[in-house]
């Protein structure tokens, strides 16, 4: 990805998805009535013109927000503590890797706008998730809906990272 982002970053992302999957505590079929449109900003991860700074910023903000969401008293009450601790550890490692990368990308002179804009958009998206949880009084189903929503958005963000990685490989081999 044009910086010393460890090869295992993709693996860590997949591990995060696996952990989020394992965290399930209630049959999701019971929770259809709690579905909500959180309006994940798909355009942010679907574009074909991917800048390194943009990808790094999206991933960093995503992971930061997921970390914050699952690092609260409410979250501790809702989830298995062992899995939650593993999730925190994995997210912390990925954030450290990305921070190293972001510093390098900014040092290479990529636009600050490419970094701040996705961060603001994602903050609004996660604020909507927090409001929903509060509205639903942090019910088991509300947490289940949020868990699946986070898995979806993280999956899309990880795909964006893979697309940039393969684009870099293509450029490197030509």
């Amino acid at each position: 990805l044009g910086c010393d982002l460890p090869q295992n970053h993709g693996l860590l992302s997949r591990n995060t998805l696996v952990l989020l999957h394992q965290m399930r505590r209630i049959s999701p079929f019971l929770c259809l009535k709690d579905r909500r449109d959180f309006r994940f900003p798909q355009e942010m991860v679907k574009g074909s013109q991917l800048q390194k700074a943009h990808v790094m910023s999206v991933l960093h903000e995503m992971l930061q927000q997921i970390f914050s969401l699952f690092h609260t008293e409410r979250s501790s009450a809702a989830w298995n503590m062992t899995l939650l601790d593993q999730l925190h550890t994995g997210l912390h490692q990925q954030l450290q890797h990305l921070e190293t990368c972001l510093l390098q990308v900014v040092g290479e002179g990529e636009s600050a706008g490419a970094i701040s804009s996705p961060a603001l958009t994602l903050r609004r998206y996660f604020q909507g998730i927090r409001v929903y949880l509060k509205e639903k009084k942090y019910s088991d189903c509300a947490w289940e809906v949020v868990r699946m929503e986070i898995m979806k958005s993280l999956f899309l963000s990880t795909n964006m990272q893979e697309r940039l990685r393969s684009k870099d490989r293509d450029l490197g081999s030509s």
């Epitope: 999957h21 009535k33 699946m148 979806k152 999956f155």
Partner: antibody
Framework: EVQLVQSGAEVKKPGESLKISCKGS????????IGWVRQMPGKGLEWMGI????????AYSPSFQGQVTISADKSISTAYLQWSSLKASDTAMYYC??????????????WGQGTLVTVSS | DIQMTQSPSSLSASVGDRVTITCRAS???????LNWYQQKPGKAPKLLIY???SLQSGVPSRFSGSGSGTDFTLTISSLQPEDFATYYC?????????FGQGTKVEIK
């Protein structure tokens, strides 16, 4: 391109067992649920049940609970609908369709072509 | 279980007509997760509208959905020859998921 391809038509005798399949491709199979829908000749659509292929958790319509079994093999992106003892009244077209789970996205946006099951002595 | 009742069961209309099909739920679908499908003879159903009013990708804009709570409507603004089919509503609010009995749109 997202596709759900179902197994071919079956002709069976009452009391026989049967397992029909639905193979997903062109998307992440474990990111969506698979639902099964029955349509008896000249009749409407009836929801039978649904499976989350990521861990094979299922939910059934009370009308079909205990009558059929829904399963999945995520390693080959395939969902199944099976009967242990068919009845003449099981004669119908059976459709599989993908469902977004708890995500806010279109329900049953892609459907298989259907499997016609005929049960007759 | 949530019962879905469609009306009318069938209707005859001409090309260019405005057609309205209604679907009533036996209890409130509070998140408006109501879907509409079109089915032609010998074919699998096709999703037209989801979440009461969102048009599925690739579906012509002459199809629209509206309603909330217990009463929902599918409207075809100007009926085309390819629209003669059976239409089903389906609630995605709770399991068991349930379909309406269908409305057959025939040529007058």
């Amino acid at each position: 391109e997202v596709q759900l391809v179902q197994s071919g038509a079956e002709v069976k005798k009452p009391g026989e067992s049967l397992k029909i399949s639905c193979k997903g491709s062109g998307y992440s199979f474990t990111s969506y649920w698979i639902g099964w829908v029955r349509q008896m000749p000249g009749k409407g659509l009836e929801w039978m049940g649904i499976i989350d292929p990521s861990d094979s958790d299922t939910a059934y319509s009370p009308s079909f609970q205990g009558q059929v079994t829904i399963s999945a093999d995520k390693s080959i992106s395939t969902a199944y609908l099976q009967w242990s003892s068919l009845k003449a009244s099981d004669t119908a077209m059976y459709y599989c369709a993908r469902h977004p789970g708890l995500n806010w996205a279109p329900d049953f946006d892609y459907w298989g072509q259907g499997t016609l099951v005929t049960v007759s002595s | 279980d949530i019962q879905m009742t469609q009306s009318p069961s069938s209707l005859s209309a001409s090309v260019g007509d405005r057609v309205t099909i209604t679907c009533r739920a036996s209890q409130s679908i509070r998140n408006n997760y109501l879907n509409w499908y079109q089915q032609k003879p010998g074919k699998a159903p096709k999703l037209l509208i989801y979440a009461a009013s969102s048009l599925q990708s690739g579906v012509p804009s002459r199809f629209s959905g509206s309603g909330s709570g217990t009463d929902f409507t599918l409207t075809i603004s100007s009926l085309q020859p390819e629209d003669f089919a059976t239409y089903y509503c389906q609630q995605g609010y709770d399991t068991p998921l349930t379909f309406g009995q269908g409305t057959k749109v025939e040529i007058k």
